[in-house]
């Protein structure tokens, strides 16, 4: 049996729409079926409609199909909107130009080439001919409209009504020569449906006999219309899936537009110093992917051919080797001179910040006006004027209230972090937004890092715990355990809450963890007495790039002889250089036979660019960073030592300044190490522990 | 543990709804992915329902899938108008725990449910 | 966004190292990338979270390296059973997720 062709392709759809007739005379046919294209072939055959097809609507809810020998161009007749609804019309009835010699056109062309009037033709005045309507049953020998029943050489004609001329061809043009594009047709809307060779292109929205992933609801801006030829992925001009099995795809012949002007809505926003949106009006001349390898050239085709060139992009200022986005990629790209390398991204240059949907943040994000409202962990934000009170207990001055619209993300606090906002949520009060900080904004959050300020104690008083010995002046040493064995240091700096790092906790399970505090040895051996066990509640980690973790317990620990909370600097503060400070852990030893018990090893504070020195330039710190070097070579902290504390003392008080986090090697002789700065996030870890609900005891 | 249930074999444009079914935790502190693997093919993100049940999607998921959390256990993936494109193995995956704030990743996976979309 | 991970396929002998890259067209938020490794019919298991951080159950022979918009897994001492497809999976603003389209790693 002969597969019957389907014949959708031949209509243009028109979704939630249907036709309403006005005048009563016109006929109408239903029927129930399944699919628009079962409508479709019996439209397209006329079977048994005692009518000429059209148009269609067909009803999804219903499941019904209803045939009409009018259009929405026909008189008597009003388009109307219908959920339910999408309009089928039959493109030859709708379409003013045509397609090879015009043996489809079913327009309404009515005049000669020289202007005449057409003969009707069902008349035999003024001229007699044999072309009646019955006769050429599907040729739509309709009125008097310009007509090619026989596909002849010069396209539509028809009788004149001038006695003196029997027949003469009707202007009509080709559809090539009405449509028309700029550059490479990226926004070309028009209604060419075959390719450059006339096979007739396959519907957007099928996927045969072609599969393809450009689904019209899945790119709703890209005009997938029907089976129109479009440029949805930056072809060099627009082109078609085919409705010949063996053809996939093919370009269409379509010419471009005399002027080439551009609508001003299909120009990108030009821009030369950053991006805006996916970056295709990017101008600049920024020419190296984003490691420093330089852009080939787009007019050459060494070291990788390519079809991307001037000539086929037409509009996408394709010059020298500057980053460009010629083709709707994610951001502006080039091919690379490195023969291994194809293609990068020249993902450097910086986003231009809008003033909605802002990406990045300046500073401390306090003048952030962006309209990002969800947290870090995918929380709504909750509306600023639902959180006053809140907000009034941890700031003591009057919030911008100008700046606290809606639930947008804010900084009212001057959070040293970024933007962040409440959630309603009770386990995760507040949280941080996930916006990061503009790429290359040097502003810095906190000032005069290498000059000693602010002072990091908060008192000046000596502090000695009932003159207890040496062992008691470690009680906020944590040891943290994964599935029953050490795996992390940690500093109580609060009963309920544990300072340690981020690369302690392999699992999110919170039952693998638990705390053990007032222990010496690393398997609580002799500490019996004076051993803690705490189960784990909750794992905040710290603002973006920190490497911190505030461990909430799940009950408070008991200060006594042995466990106690150690204090945190002020915040921003600086500790001068040459300061003595150690650090504690049950780590890797270097000995073979290691006894468990907790080590010291003495450092001391070095300014950020002497320590960049001793790491012979390689590392440039920040301000979230703390150097101290050792006084023994090859001492100081290594694996187990992790989110253990770097301590210090300042006016008889000791602080914890830094916490250890994986760096560049264990102990490496004249390399010191590199802490996680504590005071840098000493707002945050204070806000955490006034905001964070705990257990109490 | 987590496990996906609803996958068959659909004909092009009837909708169908995945359920991912979880024990051992709590829907109200963890967030949820939807993430599929067409054969042979690699794995793409769909969406998600978060912590608080609001909803994410990629790009090309709006408006073809929609993901509700419907209990404290159960999260769904409704595939409105299924085209054969979506033939796949469907994943549920947590992505965020309110019990570890700040560490967005998938650890905890269902084995998944094979969707077949065929005429 | 869009993760674009290289090569799509490598191959090394038993104790070999295998270095696999990931590409991001925009930034990835606090550097929440991870590595996943799948098995044929099996779920993906994480090795790294948070660009660097060790899984659970993951040797140290898996690291993870990189910030910002490039990435890196890196494979030492190469075991047969190492054999498997690895995906990268970035977090960005407005909380989307994205999967690089994965690297097959063949064992010889």
């Known amino acids: 049996q002969r597969k019957r062709r389907n014949t959708i392709h031949e209509f243009k759809k028109s979704a939630k729409t249907t036709l309403i007739k006005i005048d009563p005379a016109l006929k109408i046919k239903t029927k129930k079926v399944n699919t628009a294209d079962q409508c479709a072939n019996r439209c397209t055959r006329n079977k048994g409609l005692p009518f000429t097809c059209k148009a269609f609507v067909f009803d999804k809810a219903r499941k019904q199909c209803l045939w009409f020998p009018f259009n929405s161009m026909s008189s008597g007749v009003k388009k109307e909107f219908g959920h339910e609804f999408d309009l089928y019309e039959n493109k030859d009835y709708i379409r003013n130009c045509i397609i090879g010699k015009g043996r489809s056109y079913k327009g309404t062309v009515s005049i000669t080439k020289s202007g005449i009037k057409c003969q009707p033709w069902s008349s035999m005045i003024p001229h007699e001919h044999s072309f009646l309507p019955s006769s050429y049953r599907g040729k739509d020998l309709q009125e008097n409209y310009c007509r090619n029943p026989r596909g002849e050489e010069g396209g539509p004609w028809c009788f004149t009504s001038n006695p003196e001329v029997r027949y003469e061809v009707c202007d009509i043009p080709q559809c090539s020569e009405v449509e028309c594009m700029t550059c490479n047709g990226e926004s070309y809307r028009g209604l060419m449906d075959h390719t450059e060779s006339g096979k007739i292109c396959q519907r957007w929205d099928h996927q045969t006999p072609h599969r393809h992933k450009f689904l019209p609801e899945r790119y709703p801006d890209k005009g997938f219309d029907d089976n129109y030829c479009r440029n949805p992925d930056g072809q060099p001009r627009p082109w078609c899936y085919t409705l010949d099995p063996h053809t996939r795809w093919e370009y269409c012949a379509i010419k471009t537009c005399a002027d080439n002007t551009m609508n001003d809505t299909d120009v990108p926003l030009e821009t030369t110093e950053c991006i805006q949106g996916q970056g295709e009006g990017y101008r600049g001349t920024v020419n190296t992917i984003w490691n420093g390898i330089p852009c080939q050239r787009w007019d050459s085709q060494y070291p990788h051919e390519h079809d991307m060139t001037p000539e086929n992009f037409k509009c996408k200022d394709l010059r020298e080797n500057y980053c460009r986005n010629p083709d709707g990629s994610e951001s502006p790209w080039c091919f690379t001179t490195d023969p291994n390398i194809r293609v990068g991204y020249c993902s450097q240059i910086p986003n231009c910040d809008m003033s909605h949907g802002q990406d990045c943040y300046r500073g401390n994000g306090k003048n952030y006006m962006g309209n990002l409202s969800q947290t870090r962990s995918g929380l709504t934000c909750s509306m600023w004027d639902k959180n006053m009170e809140d907000l009034h207990r941890h700031i003591f001055w009057e919030p911008d209230a100008s700046k606290l619209n809606e639930n947008y993300c804010r900084n009212p606090d001057d959070d040293a972090h970024g933007p962040w906002c409440y959630t309603g949520n009770p386990l995760i009060p507040w949280d941080y937004c996930p916006i990061s900080r503009c790429e290359g904004d040097t502003t810095p959050t906190i000032v005069n890092l290498d000059h000693p300020v602010i002072s990091c104690a908060k008192t000046k008083q000596l502090r000695v715990v009932n003159g207890i010995p040496t062992r008691t002046n470690i009680g906020w040493m944590v040891s943290l355990r994964y599935r029953n064995k050490h795996i992390c240091g940690g500093s109580l700096i609060k009963e309920s809450w544990v300072l340690t790092a981020r690369q302690c906790f392999p699992s999110r399970d919170l039952k693998d963890y638990e705390a053990w505090l007032g222990i010496h040895d690393v398997h609580g051996r002799g500490d019996e007495k004076c051993k803690q066990v705490l189960n784990v509640s909750q794992l905040v980690y710290g603002p973006e790039g920190s490497d911190l973790v505030l461990m909430k317990l799940a009950r408070p620990a008991v200060l006594d002889d042995f466990v106690s909370t150690i204090d945190l600097p002020n915040y921003g503060c600086t500790i001068p250089e040459k300061t003595s400070c150690s650090v504690y852990g049950w780590g890797y030893t270097g000995l073979i036979n290691y006894d468990g018990l907790l080590r010291v090893a003495h450092l001391y504070i070095m300014g950020n660019e002497k320590c960049s020195q001793h790491h012979r330039g390689k590392v440039t710190l920040n301000e979230s960073e703390i150097c101290a070097g050792a006084e023994k070579i090859g001492s100081g902290p290594c694996e187990g030592d992790y989110g253990g504390p770097l301590v210090c003392e300042q006016h008889k008080m000791r602080m914890v300044l830094g916490v250890i986090v994986p760096g560049r090697g264990c102990a490496i002789p004249n390399r010191p190490g590199i802490f996680v700065r504590v005071a840098y996030y000493a707002k945050w870890i204070h806000k955490i522990i006034l905001t964070y609900k705990v257990p109490q005891s | 543990s987590v496990e996906e249930s609803g996958g068959r074999l659909v004909t092009p444009g009837t909708p169908l709804t995945l359920t991912c079914t979880v024990s051992g935790i709590d829907l109200n502190s963890n967030g949820m992915s939807w993430v599929r693997q067409a054969p042979g093919e690699g794995l793409e993100w769909i969406g998600a329902?978060?912590?608080?049940?609001?909803t994410y999607y990629t790009n090309w998921a709006k408006g073809r899938f929609t993901i509700s959390k419907t209990s404290s256990t159960t999260v769904d993936l409704k595939i409105t108008s299924p085209t054969t494109e979506d033939t796949a193995t469907y994943f549920c995956t947590r992505g965020e725990y309110a019990g570890v704030v700040g560490s967005n990743y998938f650890d905890l996976w269902g084995q998944g449910t094979l969707v077949t979309v065929s005429s | 966004q869009v993760l674009t991970q290289t090569p799509p396929s490598v191959s090394a002998v038993v104790g070999g190292t295998v270095t696999i890259n990931c590409q991001s067209s925009q930034r990835i938020y606090s550097n929440w990338l991870s590595w996943y490794q799948q098995k044929p019919g099996q779920t993906p298991k994480p090795l790294i979270y948070a660009a660097s951080s060790l899984a659970s159950g993951v040797p140290s022979r898996f690291k993870g390296s990189g910030s910002g918009t490039q990435f890196t897994l890196t494979i030492s001492d190469l075991e047969c059973d190492d054999a498997a497809s690895y995906y990268c999976a970035g977090y960005y603003s407005g909380h989307i997720y994205s999967f690089g389209g994965g690297t097959e790693v063949v064992v010889k």
């Open positions: 329902s978060s912590i608080d049940g609001t």
